[in-house]
Every structure is written in C-alpha cells, then in structure tokens.
C-alpha cells in the first residue's frame, strides 16, 4: 500500500518547480521528503496544503530540528511575528514590546519601552527610599506648627538610553513640628508679630466691651 504511494510520488518530481530540494514529490501534494539539511515546510493555500523544501523558514516560522529531520514550525508565542525557537520570539506584532523572547503590551517593572525598536530595555534602577528626614522649615526644627520632611533614594543603575527618564529620587511631605516653640523662649520675628497682633485684638475687644457696658448703664441712669 505505502510502496505504491512512494513510487508514484517520485515520478513527476524533476519537472515540477515546487519539487526543488525534494527526495519525494508529487504534483498534488508537493514535497513529502526533503534533501538533508533542508526544512520541510507545509504551505497552505485555502483548503490546499503542499510540502516544500526550504533552506530557511519563512517569517512566522522557525526551524524545528530533530536528528536528520528539519521542519518549519509555526511561531506560537502570543503576539509574536517571528521567532528563533518554540519559546523565543525575535519580533513582536505591531503594538507589542519584545522582552526576553516574549511580547508584552507594557514593559515589566524595571524596564522601559524603546519605541524605535519596540523593545523593553533596562530602565533607570533606583535604590530603596531612605527614612523620612526631620520635620523642618527655613532650616529650623522649631518655632512653627507645620514644616516639611524629605526622603531620598539613589540611582543604582543609569538607563541604557539618555532618553529614558529616571523616577523621582527625592520627595517631600507636610509634617507637624514636634516643637512649636523653640527652647529658651526665643521666638521668631513672625511669631512675635503674631503675638502682638493677638494682644492688640484682645485690647480692642476689651475696650469695645467696656464701651458697650458704659452705654448701657448710661441709658439706664437716664
């Protein structure tokens, strides 16, 4: 049964251009066996499929090798256009970034997208945040109700490309001062000014109170 299959296939192989590099070929099915080191490729055209023997695999396929058996296997990595092997992509579909043989819609943490090559490259690597610094204002740690505290982190590794920005390496936040009044009674000019204004306001308030009391008793006496 199979012997008949092989002989009939060999018959028409010299004249047919799709039989290039074939050891067994037919007009209907193309190549069924390839010369050593060539890759068997199953080309599909609608419902028809026929074999070809190629020196290298077309785009979207990679060379799958077993001892003396080479074949073009379809790239099956998600969102991959061309690959080197079963699990290593070399070119991603439009809109995806290539990173370590895989395709991502966003680069993983620590990596930045390089738009010109659509690859994820090592981004700017920063260290851990320091502890928050002392709460201060105008370089003083007392004399105010509110101040600012700051923390920093170091750049551990500069990015591969200058166009890749580093994340912030210093940040500040509002904080409540532990000592509103400075030791030794010394107050800042601003604080003194505030106190004087308060005193003045209290004196005026007291004077107004006294004035209204005076008016009331005066009316009562009339």
């Amino acid at each position: 049964q199979g012997n008949r299959w092989r002989r009939s296939k060999r018959a028409s192989y010299v004249s047919n251009p799709i039989c290039k590099g074939c050891l067994s070929c037919s007009k209907d099915n193309g190549c069924s066996r390839c010369q050593q080191k060539l890759f068997f490729f199953l080309r599909r055209e609608g419902m028809r499929q026929y074999g070809e023997c190629l020196h290298s695999c077309p785009s979207g396929y990679y060379g799958h090798r077993a001892p003396d058996m080479n074949r073009c296997a379809r790239c099956r990595i998600e969102n991959c256009d061309s690959c080197f092997s079963k699990d290593f992509c070399t070119k991603c579909k439009v809109g995806f970034y290539l990173h370590r043989g895989r395709c991502f819609d966003e680069c993983p943490d620590g990596f930045a997208p390089l738009e010109e090559t659509m690859e994820c490259v090592e981004g700017c690597e920063v260290g851990h945040w320091s502890e928050w610094g002392t709460c201060s204002r105008n370089n003083r740690t007392c004399g105010f109700k509110w101040g600012l505290e700051t923390r920093t982190r170091q750049i551990v590794k500069k990015p591969v490309k200058d166009t890749i920005l580093c994340p912030t390496i210093a940040e500040s936040r509002r904080c409540k001062m532990t000592m509103r009044h400075c030791p030794g009674g010394k107050r800042t000019p601003k604080a003194k000014e505030k106190r004087n204004k308060k005193k003045k306001r209290k004196l005026i308030e007291r004077a107004q109170e006294q004035h209204s009391v005076f008016l009331a008793t005066d009316r009562a006496n009339q």
């Epitope: 049964q1 199979g2 012997n3 299959w5 092989r6 296939k9 050891l23 067994s24 099915n29 193309g30 190549c31 069924s32 066996r33 390839c34 050593q36 068997f40 199953l42 499929q49 074999g51 799958h64 077993a66 001892p67 003396d68 058996m69 074949r71 296997a73 379809r74 099956r76």
Partner: antibody
Framework: EVQLQESGPSLVKPSQTLSLTCSVT????????WSWIRKFPGNKLEFMGY???????YYIPSLKSRVSITRDTSKNQYYLQLNSVTTEDTATYYC?????????????WGQGTLVTVSS | DIKMTQSPSSMYASLGERVTITCKAS??????LSWFQQKPGKSPKTLIY???RLIDGVPSRFSGSGSGQDYSLTINSLEYEDMGIYYC?????????FGAGTRLEIK
C-alpha cells in the same frame, strides 16, 4: 513491497536487557527513519525512538537513559536494546518506518513481537 | 510531551451508520496528525496523514478533518471490516504521541 520483521526473545528476566532485531526488505535503511513502537497490555501505544538514514538517533526522554537503537546497513537490519527491564516493559514491540513530515508516518509496521518481563 | 485525548474510548455502531472519532491535542499541532486502525492480532495500519490525506488503497468512506488542537476521523457508512481500535498520532513535536485509542464494535 516494504516488509519489516521483528525477532528476539519473548521472555526476559527483570533487570536484564531486552534485545530485538528488525529485518527490513524492499527498502534500504540508509533512506528514511526506522523506529520502535511498543503496545502495552492496556492497548496504549508508545513511540520509543528512531534511527535515521545517516545513523543519527532520537530517544524519548523517559527512556533515554536505558534505550539504544543501532543498525547494520550490510544486513539491512536495525536493533533495539532496552536495559534494566521491569515488568512494566512487558509489551508487544513493533518496528515501523516513515519517510519524513510530508508523507505518511509509520506507513509500514512489522507484525509485532510480544515480550514478557517476568522472573 | 503533547497529550492526545481521544474520545470515545469505545463505541458500538450499526452497519451503514456514520461514525466520528475525535482527538484533542494539549496544544496546537498544526495539522501534523495521522489516524491508524488496528485489528485484533494485526499491526496498526495507517489510514490518514497530515489530518486529511488518505493513504492509497484506504476506502473513501474514511475522511479526516481538523486544525489547531481538534481533529476527527469520520467513517461515512460503517462496514463490518471497520471494527477494530482506532488511534490518532501527533507528529508536530517530538516525542510523537498517540491517543489512547477508540474501540469500535458493531452493534
């Protein structure tokens, strides 16, 4: 017509080596791929490996450490050696051939030989 | 390894009936699938290769179809000589692997 014929002992003791021969007529073993397949008592078929036209071999990972396929082109025969057998290796062993991805796989089979592993 | 899940594991069918056996691969096998028939005491016989190509001498009532992970073998009008065990085989990737088989018996 291509014909394959297995031969070898039908009984092997545990821990010993199972050795089988496949004699080929109607085709040369210097063309195509020559394999061994076994069928376990529960009807499960297992491809074991092959030797190619150039003498290169492929073995399935689960048997790699104890299987060997060799050939003698002058006799147009190829061989299977399976070391350290256990009762789990009791099966019908077939030799079969194919000629590449575009053709039928295992178009020709031997009639099979039942090998029992028992003490 | 690629696992081939074949169903049903056994079935009874009447003569003249249309019979379908299916095989599901654990991953896309790109049409690299064959079907075999084995009768008691005989070695397996190839029926179909590359999903739908019929071997010379195999009756035209046998046909194969499928793509990706799902494949099927159809016997259009069952005949008595069709009873036996049917196996699928994937050869997309080494090690090539067989389905567990479908035992087809006549009602």
């Amino acid at each position: 017509e291509v014909q394959l014929q297995e031969s070898g002992p039908s009984l092997v003791k545990p821990s010993q080596t199972l050795s089988l021969t496949c004699s080929v007529t109607g085709d040369s073993i210097t063309s195509g791929y020559w394999s061994w397949i076994r069928k376990f008592p529960g009807n499960k078929l297992e491809f074991m490996g092959y030797i190619s036209f150039s003498g290169k071999t492929y073995y399935i990972p689960s048997l790699k450490s104890r299987v060997s396929i060799t050939r003698d082109t002058s006799k147009n025969q190829y061989y299977l050696q399976l070391n350290s057998v256990t009762t789990e290796d009791t099966a019908t062993y077939y030799c079969a051939t194919y000629h590449g991805y575009g053709g039928p796989w295992f178009a020709y089979w031997g009639q099979g030989t039942l090998v029992t592993v028992s003490s | 390894d690629i696992k081939m899940t074949q169903s049903p594991s056994s079935m009874y069918a009447s003569l003249g009936e249309r019979v379908t056996i299916t095989c599901k691969a654990s991953q896309d096998i790109d049409s690299y699938l064959s079907w075999f028939q084995q009768k008691p005491g005989k070695s397996p016989k190839t029926l179909i290769y590359l999903t739908n190509r019929l071997i010379d001498g195999v009756p035209s009532r046998f046909s194969g179809s499928g793509s990706g992970q799902d494949y099927s073998l159809t016997i259009n009008s069952l005949e008595y000589e069709d009873m036996g065990i049917y196996y699928c085989l994937q050869y997309d990737e080494f090690p090539v692997t067989f389905g567990a088989g479908t035992r087809l018996e006549i009602k």
